[in-house]
Interface confidence: medium
């Protein structure tokens, strides 16, 4: 069984399905947001280019105790070929630029939708 985002599915998950499910989760986060997401925690901004999945995970993994993004963290790990742990710093991060998690999620969502629309699933 392949487990993606906490849901078991029979056999490998097609890349298009995995990306769509990640988009769905980010949509849910943005639409269901009541209080400031993750108590207004700040994360490193990233360049939305090749390797951005790992960079996004490296940023978000430094946010602890925020259940709202735990599923997103798990899903992003499925897109990143190497193990990511807290404290890692990628060259894709925009140095000295931090943004709120809520804005990070919105920016990532818009970019992932663009990739989905263009058929760039990997």
């Amino acid at each position: 069984l392949t487990c993606l985002g906490g849901f078991a599915s029979p056999g490998p998950v097609p890349p298009s399905t995995a990306l769509r499910e990640l988009i769905e989760e980010l949509v849910n986060i943005t639409q269901n947001q009541k209080a400031p997401l993750c108590n207004g925690s700040m994360v490193w901004s990233i360049n939305l280019t090749a390797g951005m999945y790992c960079a996004a995970l490296e940023s978000l993994i430094n946010v602890s105790g925020c259940s709202a993004i735990e599923k997103t963290q798990r899903m992003l790990s499925g897109f990143c070929p190497h193990k990511v742990s807290a404290g890692q710093f990628s060259s894709l991060h925009v140095r000295d630029t931090k943004i709120e998690v809520a804005q990070f999620v919105k920016d990532l969502l818009l970019h992932l939708k663009k990739l989905f629309r263009e058929g760039q699933f990997n």
Partner: nanobody
Framework: EVQLLESGGGLVQPGGSLRLSCAAS????????MSWVRQAPGKGLEWVSS????????YYADSVKGRFTISRDNSKNTLYLQMNSLRAEDTAVYYC???FGLGFDYWGQGTLVTVSS
């Protein structure tokens, strides 16, 4: 209270066309992604198409790409699905849903589309 009411389903011959509508109420329609999903007899839910709340950009499952067109009229709080070149395998109950893909929080009662000669 959020309500989604689908209409436009029916019996159509293979190769024919149908236009489904979904009247939405109870929320700010223009601000949300909307989707169509379907359930064929004896099968699970299948995502068909989504449209952004703003943009609007559209997204399609490979099985309907080039045949189906999703659109919306925010002034009428209505979502549409134009279905052309229908096939027997398109037979299903079609649901309008608030959200993207299958990650929706509200959906309608559905409208049955039967493609048969």
């Amino acid at each position: 209270e959020v309500q989604l009411l689908e209409s436009g389903g029916g019996l159509v011959q293979p190769g024919g066309s149908l236009r489904l509508s979904c009247a939405a109420s109870g929320f700010t329609f223009g601000g949300y992604d909307m989707s169509w999903v379907r359930q064929a007899p004896g099968k699970g839910l299948e995502w068909v198409s989504s449209i952004d709340g703003v943009g609007p950009h559209t997204y399609y499952a490979d099985s309907v790409k080039g045949r189906f067109t999703i659109s919306r009229d925010n002034s009428k709080n209505t979502l549409y699905l134009q279905m052309n070149s229908l096939r027997a395998e398109d037979t299903a109950v079609y649901y309008c849903a608030k959200g993207f893909g299958l990650g929706f929080d509200y959906w309608g009662q559905g409208t049955l589309v039967t493609v048969s000669s």
